[in-house]
Amino acid sequence: KIDACKRGDVTVKPSHVILLGSTVNITCSLKPRQGCFHYSRRNKLILYKFDRRINFHHGHSLNSQVTGLPLGTTLFVCKLACINSDEIQICGAEIFVGVAPEQPQNLSCIQKGEQGTVACTWERGRDTHLYTEYTLQLSGPKNLTWQKQCKDIYCDYLDFGINLTPESPESNFTAKVTAVNSLGSSSSLPSTFTFLDIVRPLPPWDIRIKFQKASVSRCTLYWRDEGLVLLNRLRYRPSNSRLWNMVNVTKAKGRHDLLDLKPFTEYEFQISSKLHLYKGSWSDWSESLRAQTPEEEPTGMLDVWYMKRHIDYSRQQISLFWKNLSVSEARGKILHYQVTLQELTGGKAMTQNITGHTSWTTVIPRTGNWAVAVSAANSKGSSLPTRINIMNLCEAGLLAPRQVSANSEGMDNILVTWQPPRKDPSAVQEYVVEWRELHPGGDTQVPLNWLRSRPYNVSALISENIKSYICYEIRVYALSGDQGGCSSILGNSKHKAPLSGPHINAITEEKGSILISWNSIPVQEQMGCLLHYRIYWKERDSNSQPQLCEIPYRVSQNSHPINSLQPRVTYVLWMTALTAAGESSHGNEREFCLQGKAN
């Protein structure tokens, strides 16, 4: 706190507010009889800049020229020092350093809409740190002038509140902005423009779309614009896309036909307007119109596959599977699939519409030649049917692909490789790689996956519906005309040791040997493809190492004989399972004593 200047005065020249880089004169003078007692020569006046001494003088006054002050405020304090006493504050001064306004740059004016008002913006340049008054002046024909002021440190926008009209669209107007503060002034370069230069139309409104005869090929976009609009640009895109299609149109009068829209697609449409071919600016984009185009009949054909299962001597089960058409092929909401089953020699046909599924199972006689046709239908029609002759896909042994392997390829991918069949490899028309989760019961409800591969390919990466720690039964089919050959393998994308061993459910004696039966490990505990089972046994109460028998894993197998047990000796038996990653923990332990006679 600096006391009011009772003992002396501080005067400042030229002002308390100065230009950056200029000099200020500070004079400190004592009032009469306010110096040290006895001798005025002993008056020592000291000038402080903040807390640092910058000058001193013996006598009644001190004069100091100060330069190099930074932007903002600097505090100076004048003090009196007498012998044998503390320094006494005389008076203080704050000097504020600012800058004169720079020339305002990039002055530009705009009138939003034909009924809007003229508003201008500019770049202020360097911050002056001072109250700066901006005056915007607009002069027009017939010596008309308008003026608007804003008194704000950060002023870079002013609205004249006047409306330019199109009566004389080529008349020139000139705008200029002047910035003034206590340290100086500066004016922008003048900006000259016409009505057409500065009127920015309002964005179009009331946008609608019409499809004549509910057809995507007869589509018209309608909108409303201000009266003087000459040009429009349209942009549109599918709602799920980031890229716009752009169209420029002249004298559209609020309508334009669009010819390249895709069926059954939600589009976003926006329109912008301009008054003149090369003058003025485009309006903002209109609000978006979102609309779905009508359906068209599906294109493309379904990818169909099938599976045959023997039921008895006279019947077989056929399971048909197909993949959904892509959105661009479906061209609408698929209402149903039409499946036609026909016996080729007798001509008897059966047609069924399937909704909500992409599979169909039926039972047919084992005799006769059967064919199926599957098509997809939306509200506008059906796709071309995919026709398949039902054959024994694995009948031709010479067409079976050779050396099939399945290897993990990163997360949730399996790379399947094979060699062409021995029979003339050029006869192969295509390969089909099929995979499904391995279920010990051979459950036909397990979803089937497949992909088609060109005849020159000898590998395929399967990734659809592949889960970690699940074993898949993979088949590679080579198809040639009405013949097929196949090979199969088990594979997984990721594996670890099974979480449990098989559960022994029975041990029976048969002619001096035993038959061990077990329950399969639950699928979720197998942790990949099982390679082997191990049966361990040792004499009860013995500390010796157990003996073991390793059995290659086969899906359907759940029993195995052992004939190396001694009669009338009690054994403890248990089982484990192995994947490529390691061995499971023990399953349950069972005791058994063979009753038969010793050899």
Partner: nanobody
Framework: QVQLQESGGGLVQLGGSLTLSCAAS????????MSWYRQAPGKQRELVAE???????TYADSVEGRFTISRDNAKNIVDLQMNSLKPEDTAVYYC?????????????WGRGTQVTVSS
Amino acid sequence: QVQLQESGGGLVQLGGSLTLSCAASGSAALIFLMSWYRQAPGKQRELVAEVSRYGSTTYADSVEGRFTISRDNAKNIVDLQMNSLKPEDTAVYYCKADQYYGDSLRSSWGRGTQVTVSS
């Protein structure tokens, strides 16, 4: 922003005295500088005198020794004691207050009071 009200103007004889007063109201905190400016017909507005919140002063060369500026920080009042008035002192006198606004100064002006010196 601060509002400023000037008073004390009027007609005065050559060589006479007059005291102008300016009262600040509203958000009058942190007024850095209070000043008197004047504008004679057809001329630019010019600084007459200013006083900082610490009591330091500045005078235009043309009024030094004749005019005294003083300030009451508690009441936010600034007075301009004008002695030995001359015809060239005839002008509209404006009060101005500069306030801190962040790291900048924001100025407020009064509406002015007329001083006429007759010979």
